[in-house]
């Protein structure tokens, strides 16, 4: 417990102190006091540096003194032989004696008292920044006018914080500017502008003079600007060392001026103003900004339009432009939107053709459609090459966005027919020689495929059965073979209007206009065993001359059989109509003169007994195209004949091309178009 005074006596005092003693006393007086320790008697064995016996006075870690020997007072009015004054409130006294004393020594008597210390003067470090006031047991600090005492009760500073500047323009200076700024102060100024405006600070070099940095480059006094998470400074020295124009990119700025105790200069003065927040002129690829400006600021609106072939994709919706607004935070709205290359998507598939999977479906990519060759070709031209256009469509130079159309190649058999000897006098054939050949099972007859949806045949074949069952793609017509071939289902039968319908068809003598069309329900898929025959052109090139050769095919009667099982074919020449007239009808159902011969009929045959016969009706009389030797066209259709193995009569298809085309056009479906 601290005391204000006390007495310290050596052991056995005033008797001689014993040998080999070590004793210490801890003196403590109240806080705010020092200690005055004084000795009134001192009789201790003398030795060099008081090595044998001694009394030691310690203050903290410092030895204030070490005493031995005898002392007497120099002042007859004072008993004090030795004294110590320490400005601290604690002191330690230690007495030591060695193992022997040559004489009898009585030791010491000492007294301590608490004494007032002058904190204002007694220490090297001045406790107060400005005015120090001592009192018994303590001190207090005070400040000059316009200064206030900080919470540490030692330092005085200027009350320069708390100002908030909201005007769009203003001036701020250090306290007392241009007189020296106060020491030991922290001045904080706040600029708070409306959102969308950035604080721009401007200084002149000469308006800045702040205590320079130390040798390590640290500012002793400093000016700092803080805008959000950005800091400008600290700045110090003679003349402003930073940029004279500071764009803070923020509507809020804190200015912090910190000074220490020494080295006051004139300080600083700055101006500020609010600039509408600039937004960067961003480089948005593949787009154009409207309006184009050197600088964009808060509330500016731009329309960003994608270049051709690029689009903005937001969700599932594609657009060619978007608006962006310069926002209060200096960032553009819709900044996530980008002009991306237009994606034309996976190209549409086409019937009877294909498109290779594109490496890319983006703007500028190229794809190629091809038809399933050699059975289909591209009807509407354009070469099949499409590029991904700016509007997101696959576009062809000729067709635009219209898709190519693959239509069957006509009149080209996969294997040419080599003339043998059967049919009537014709020979075995393969369906690949006559891929247009259609088989009708009731009545047993033939027809010719002329495109995906239409079969051409003789009127007398379908007059009694308007829902014929037809097959394509098979050389042989056994049930098992037909089951593996393609069955065609009719949608409607169109008999030529000039064909006379009879109640008893068996007695027919007039086969004029013996032609009919069968519209199919579904399109036929072409291939090596199924493909159409061409129609004749309307030019005179397609007028047949006597001797012109044509091919006939079918499963009709042969020399050995009423019906062939495997396809038969023969090559026959065109003959004058009179040759057919001259042949006697084998089993006449009427007078020979009753049989009608017209220009709508072709007469052919007469060579080596080659002829069509019962069961071949409706099949094509195929002639090589005069303008393209690789193709065959249907010059005639097997119609009737006076006698098998002689001459036969065939419907002259050229005379019906207009009717065929008109019938097909009027009865086409959107799917075909």
């Amino acid at each position: 417990e601290p005391t204000m005074y006390g007495e310290i006596l050596s052991p056995n005092y005033p008797q001689a102190y014993p040998s080999e003693v070590e004793k210490s006393w801890d003196i403590e007086v109240p806080e705010g006091y020092g200690i005055h320790l004084y000795f009134t008697h001192l009789d201790i064995e003398l030795s060099e540096n008081c090595a044998y016996d001694s009394v030691q006075i310690i203050s903290g870690d410092t030895e204030e003194g070490r005493l031995c020997g005898q002392r007497s007072s120099n002042n007859p009015h004072s008993p004090i032989v030795e004294e110590f004054q320490v400005p601290y409130n604690k002191l330690q006294v230690i007495f030591k004696s060695d193992f022997s004393n040559e004489e009898r020594f009585t030791g010491f008597a000492a007294y301590y008292v608490a004494t007032d210390i002058n904190e204002c003067t007694d220490f090297v470090d001045v406790p107060c920044s400005h005015f120090c006031n001592n009192f018994i047991g303590g001190y207090f600090c005070s400040c000059p006018p316009e200064y206030f005492l900080h919470d540490d009760m030692k330092n005085c500073g200027v009350n320069c914080s708390g100002d908030v500047f909201t005007a769009l323009i203003g001036e701020i200076a250090s306290p007392n500017y241009p007189k020296p700024y106060p020491e030991n102060s922290r001045c904080e100024y706040q600029i708070r502008l409306e959102k969308g405006f950035q604080v721009v600070v401007t200084l002149r070099r000469e308006d800045f003079d702040v205590e320079a940095a130390d040798s390590a480059g640290n500012c002793l006094d400093s000016l700092v600007f803080v805008a959000g998470d950005r800091q400008f400074g600290p700045y110090c020295g003679h003349g402003f060392p930073g940029p004279l124009n500071i764009e803070t990119k923020s509507n809020a700025l804190d200015i912090i001026f910190q000074t220490d105790l020494t080295g006051q200069k004139k300080g600083w003065k700055l101006r500020y103003h609010g600039d509408p927040m600039p937004c960067p002129k961003e480089d948005t690829p593949n787009s154009v900004w409207e309006p184009a400006k050197a600088k964009y600021v808060f509330r500016d609106v731009v329309q960003i339009t994608c270049l051709d072939g690029f689009e903005v994709v937001e969700g599932r919706v594609g657009a060619t432009s978007f608006y962006s607004t310069c926002q209060s935070n200096g960032k553009w709205s819709n900044s996530k939107l980008k002009c991306q290359p237009v994606d034309c998507g996976i190209p549409e598939s086409i019937e009877n053709g294909k498109v290779e999977d594109p490496e890319s479906t983006l703007f500028g990519s190229v794809i190629r459609y091809t038809c399933e060759e050699p059975y289909y070709y591209m009807e509407n031209g354009g070469g099949g090459e499409y590029h991904c256009a700016g509007n997101g469509s696959w576009v062809n130079e000729v067709l635009g966005p219209e898709l190519p159309k693959c239509v069957p190649v006509c009149g080209v058999p996969r294997e040419p027919f080599e003339e043998k000897q059967r049919i009537i006098g014709g020979s075995d054939a393969d369906i690949k020689n006559f891929p247009w050949q259609v088989f009708f099972d009731n009545p047993w007859a033939g027809g010719a495929l002329i495109n995906e949806y239409w079969v051409l045949t003789a009127a007398h074949v379908v007059e009694g059965n308007r829902e014929p069952t037809m097959y394509v793609g098979s050389t042989s017509v056994q049930t098992s073979r037909l089951a593996k071939s393609k069955m065609l289902t009719p949608e409607h039968v169109f008999i030529h209007p000039g064909w006379k319908l009879l109640e008893v068809p068996e007695g027919r003598t007039n086969f004029d206009n013996d032609i009919a069309l069968v519209r199919l329900k579904d399109p036929v898929k072409m291939g090596p065993t199924v493909s159409p025959i061409c129609l004749p052109g309307t030019s005179s090139d397609y007028n047949l001359m006597d001797g012109d050769l044509g091919l006939i095919s079918g499963w009709g009667r042969t020399e050995k059989r009423d019906r062939a099982v495997r396809l038969k074919a023969a090559r026959l020449p065109v003959a004058p109509l009179r040759k057919c007239k001259e042949v006697k009808v084998e089993k006449p159902t009427a007078d020979a003169e009753a049989y009608v011969f017209t220009p709508n009929m072709i007469c052919a045959g007469g060579e080596k007994g080659m002829d069509s016969c019962k069961g071949d009706s409706g099949g094509a009389f195929a002639v090589q195209d005069p303008n393209d030797k690789t193709k065959f066209y249907a010059a005639g259709l097997v119609s009737w004949g006076p006698q098998c193995g002689t001459y036969g009569l065939y419907t002259r298809v050229k005379n019906y091309v207009d009717w065929i085309m008109k019938t097909m056009q009027e009865n086409s479906t959107p799917r075909e178009d």
């Epitope: 393969d430 050995k560 059989r561």
Partner: antibody, heavy 118, light 107 residues
Framework: EVQLVESGGGLVKPGGSLRLSCAAS????????MSWIRQAPGKGLEWVSY????????YYADSVKGRFTISRDNAKNSLYLQMNSLRAEDTAVYYC???????????WGQGTLVTVSS | DIQMTQSPSSLSASVGDRVTITCQAS??????LNWYQQKPGKAPKLLIY???NLETGVPSRFSGSGSGTDFTFTISSLQPEDIATYYC?????????FGGGTKVEIK
Amino acid sequence: EVQLVESGGGLVKPGGSLRLSCAASGFTFSDYYMSWIRQAPGKGLEWVSYISRSGSTKYYADSVKGRFTISRDNAKNSLYLQMNSLRAEDTAVYYCARDETDYAYDNWGQGTLVTVSS
Amino acid sequence: DIQMTQSPSSLSASVGDRVTITCQASQDISNYLNWYQQKPGKAPKLLIYDASNLETGVPSRFSGSGSGTDFTFTISSLQPEDIATYYCQQYEDYPLVFGGGTKVEIK
């Protein structure tokens, strides 16, 4: 006169191969469909394979499918049967036959014997 | 595959007898059937095509009939040179199948 002459038969070990030939004369070979038909010793007739005039269409009996190959060379008037992976049950007299028309065989060769035995 | 069952497998008859062989198909084969004659050590010979048509040069004592699944081959008056094995063959579908054969002998 129509003539068909087979050759190439003989003794072969199981798993071995053999190529039979049939030389045609007296008719236009390329006009006709052709077939191979075999007859195991003391047994009935078994159709083996068929080929169209141009050679583009071929059919095989299930028992030889994948092992035998029929072919023809119209320029040489010849029909062939390549027999691989032969088995004991392939032992037979092999006839080549002309399909007169519609699957009726009007002319046959004299046959060639193939023996598959280890 | 279509199965062809021929019966009898063998028969013995006297010269001048009427001989009948039957052939039954496992499914409808229309009239797609041929008949062949094979003499010992010889190649087969076509006699009848399309179930009932006599091949050129074949004696008229041979005949065929039937349609669908049941077919008959007849020798109206057996002759010594008719000793042979007779086969039916369907061509309605692949594989083309022969009957098991009927061996005809003279008593």
